[in-house]
């Protein structure tokens, strides 16, 4: 293959891969027809002048996961055909000016996971065809004005995981073609008005895990094409009324892990395409009528781990397409009989870890497609007659950790549970809390005659049986439709693997495993 170095492997497709700790310099001679060169996991510490001079046909060059800390300005001379250059996961602190000069075809430049302390306008001034620039995982503290002014074709810019404390409102002004901007995991406390005004084609903006306290009212008003907006894990305590007003294409909005106390009226909308709204881990105490009424296509609404004690009966107006509603770990004691009336397509609802003492008999009356209901760890002593009768698709019902009162009033519920045991799961069954002589005994097998009879014995001896369709699987707990183990955060749909943080803390929302990844 035109002379393949011994430390490398060369394929017929003009691909060369050189790996291993024994490599301390760019191997030679490299095949003149090489189109792709990867130098990975070596002990190379520097790149000298023109090590790639004889492979001018090179299109992709990956020099990743090495000990590289120094590069001579002329290292990439004669690579005029190069389209992809990755120097990620090295130990670069400084980039020489002119390093990328002559790389007229360069479209992707990956400088992520180094130790870069600064970038300057002169670094990228020659890269007029650049479409993707990855700078995440460095030590950048500021971006000078003009740094990206020549990158007019840039579509993707990642500045995440740096140490940025502020952003100039002018730094992105010429990036009219930018589609993805990632600024997550920095130290930004506020973003000046106008910062994103020039980004008319922006589709994704990642601002999560900063220290942003306040959003300017018109911050996103020019970003009409924005589809994904990540604002989670900041210090946002209030949302200006018009902040999301001009985002008709938005389909995912994450606001979890902030300090929101209330949701201003009309704050969400109109957002006809929003599919997911993540609001867990805030300080929301009540939900007024119509707070989500502009979100006609919303399918996932996560409100868990707040302090919600009151939900107005019209709070969920307009959410006719909602599939998943997470309200667990709040302070709910009461639910108005009409509160879920609009949620005709709801499949999963998690209400566990609240203080519900009773449920209205018609609470699920319009929600015929419910498949999973989480009611564990509340203050329920009984449930109204026939509350689940019409829920033919129900295959998961969690009722444990409630103080069930096993007097004769419990008979209808007990009999229904007996007929529908598979829906309760096998992990934990509901047990009696009172009277004392039956405390701790399974509600399903309890002999109610032993218990103290109640004053009022209902005439109807049992809940009518909800048909248990044989084609509806009774899921064992490990594959439950609405697992009580939950994701900490939505999987933010990144192509850069370095930005995905895998976590095993799945304790945030009660949803389908399909959606919890």
């Amino acid at each position: 293959y035109h002379g393949c170095p011994s430390e490398c492997t060369c394929s017929r497709a003009s691909q060369v891969e050189c790996t291993g700790a024994r490599i301390v310099a760019v191997p030679t001679p490299l095949p003149w027809n090489a189109m792709s060169l990867q130098i990975l996991n070596t002990h190379i510490t520097e790149l000298n002048e023109s090590p790639f001079l004889n492979i001018s046909a090179l299109i992709a060059l990956r020099i990743e996961k090495n000990e590289l800390s120094r590069i001579t300005p002329g290292a990439f001379r004669n690579l005029g055909s190069l389209r992809y250059l990755s120097l990620a996961n090295n130990k670069l602190q400084v980039l020489p000016i002119g390093l990328f000069q002559g790389l007229d075809s360069l479209e992707s430049l990956l400088l992520s996971s180094n130790q870069l302390l600064q970038i300057q306008p002169a670094h990228f001034s020659q890269c007029s065809n650049l479409k993707e620039l990855q700078l995440h995982g460095n030590h950048l503290e500021y971006i000078p004005d003009g740094a990206f002014d020549h990158l007019v074709g840039l579509t993707k810019l990642n500045l995440g995981k740096n140490s940025l404390t502020h952003i100039s409102p002018r730094v992105f002004q010429h990036l009219g073609n930018l589609q993805v901007l990632r600024l997550y995991e920095n130290r930004l406390t506020d973003i000046p008005m106008g910062t994103f005004d020039g980004l008319v084609n922006l589709q994704e903006l990642a601002l999560q895990q900063n220290q942003i306290g306040l959003l300017s009212p018109g911050l996103f008003h020019n970003n009409h094409n924005l589809q994904r907006l990540y604002l989670s894990n900041n210090h946002i305590s209030q949302l200006p009324p018009s902040v999301f007003m001009q985002l008709p294409q938005l389909n995912r909005l994450t606001l979890f892990g902030n300090s929101l106390k209330e949701l201003s009226p009309g704050i969400f909308g109109p957002m006809p395409n929003l599919r997911e709204l993540w609001l867990y881990d805030n300080h929301i105490s009540s939900l007024p009528d119509n707070v989500f009424s502009n979100l006609r296509q919303l399918q996932v609404l996560i409100l868990s781990r707040n302090q919600i004690s009151f939900i107005s009966p019209g709070a969920f107006n307009g959410l006719t397409e909602l599939r998943e509603l997470s309200l667990h770990t709040n302070a709910l004691q009461d639910l108005d009989g009409n509160v879920f009336r609009m949620l005709a397509n709801l499949q999963n609802i998690s209400l566990q870890n609240n203080r519900l003492r009773q449920l209205p008999g018609n609470i699920f009356a319009n929600v015929n497609g419910l498949m999973a209901i989480q009611l564990q760890n509340n203050q329920l002593e009984n449930l109204p007659l026939g509350i689940f009768d019409h829920l033919g698709k129900l295959c998961e019902l969690r009722l444990y950790d409630n103080p069930w009162r096993c007097d004769s009033d419990i008979l209808p519920l007990r009999n229904w549970l007996l007929l529908n045991q598979p829906r309760l799961g096998t992990d934990t069954v509901p047990v009696c809390f009172s009277p004392a002589n039956v405390r701790g005994q399974s509600l399903i097998i309890i002999n109610v005659n032993v218990a103290v009879p109640s004053v009022h014995v209902p005439e109807v001896p049992s809940y009518p049986e909800t048909p248990w369709y044989p084609d509806t699987p009774s899921y064992p707990d490990t594959t439950s439709v609405s697992s009580t183990t939950e994701l900490t955060s939505p999987v933010e749909d990144y192509t850069d693997l370095t930005t995905i943080q895998v976590t095993d803390d799945r304790s945030v929302w009660g949803m389908t495993q399909a959606q919890s990844g």
Epitope: D336, G337, N362
Partner: antibody, heavy 118, light 107 residues
């Protein structure tokens, strides 16, 4: 159909208390919030508070806090509003009202006139 | 507390007239505004909820509009039975508050 029937008119002396009842029918009493609203002569309507009959939880307008107590008797499907330390400006018609599909008042009692006079 | 300022406080009109009543909230209440009609000695009757939705049984001549802080109730062609007092109410945040009322009288 939903009906709210209130107790009759009352005349009270300043400093006394009054307890007005509201009997609900036509729906499951414990499942829906019941509110109390008053209207002094020639004045705007004033929301006083609500009760959730299923649990007995209440929320009051700060203006009346400490003087108003809303209770319920689930066996009688009846809500009560007691106002203490009455003053002449408490002379008003007191209404119970139930929300519909939102926190607006769809169903109203006929009203109870409470007159406070020495 | 959110103040609801209604205007005019009274108006005189004839049968067939178009009548417009406005209500201004002291802060943003979204669309969480209701309108009621009250006749002497009677309880208020719900006309409009969520700023623009007619309650069941309410004639189509009644319409509501607005959002945020400015709201309007319109009676397109006044009928004899429409002479009454009209109130707006915000139910976005506690305590729920009402406007001072607009008395519609016969000219």
């Amino acid at each position: 159909q939903v009906q709210l029937v209130q107790s009759g008119a009352e005349v009270k002396k300043p400093g006394a208390s009054v307890k007005v009842s509201c009997k609900a029918s036509g729906y499951t009493f414990t499942d829906y919030y019941i509110n109390w609203v008053r209207q002094a002569p020639g004045q705007r309507l004033e929301w006083m508070g609500w009760i959730y009959p299923g649990s007995g939880n209440t929320k009051y307008n700060e203006k009346f806090k400490g003087r108003v107590t809303i209770t319920r008797d689930t066996s009688a499907s009846t809500a009560y509003m007691e106002l203490s330390s009455l003053r002449s400006e408490d002379t008003a018609v007191y209404y119970c009202a139930r929300w519909g599909y939102g926190a607006y008042f769809t169903y109203w009692g006929q009203g109870t006139l409470v007159t406070v006079s020495s | 507390d959110i103040q609801m300022t209604q205007s005019p406080s009274s108006l005189s009109a004839s049968v067939g007239d178009r009548v417009t009543i406005t209500c201004k909230a002291s802060q943003n209440v979204g669309i969480n505004v209701a309108w009621y009609q009250q006749k002497p000695g009677k309880a208020p009757k719900l006309l409009i909820y969520s700023a623009s939705y007619r309650s069941s049984g309410v004639p189509s001549r009644f319409s509501g509009s607005g959002s945020g802080t400015d709201f309007t109730l319109t009676i397109s062609s006044l009928q004899p039975e429409d002479f009454a007092t009209y109130y707006c109410q915000q139910y976005n945040s506690f305590p729920y508050t009402f406007g001072g009322g607009t008395k519609v009288e016969i000219k």
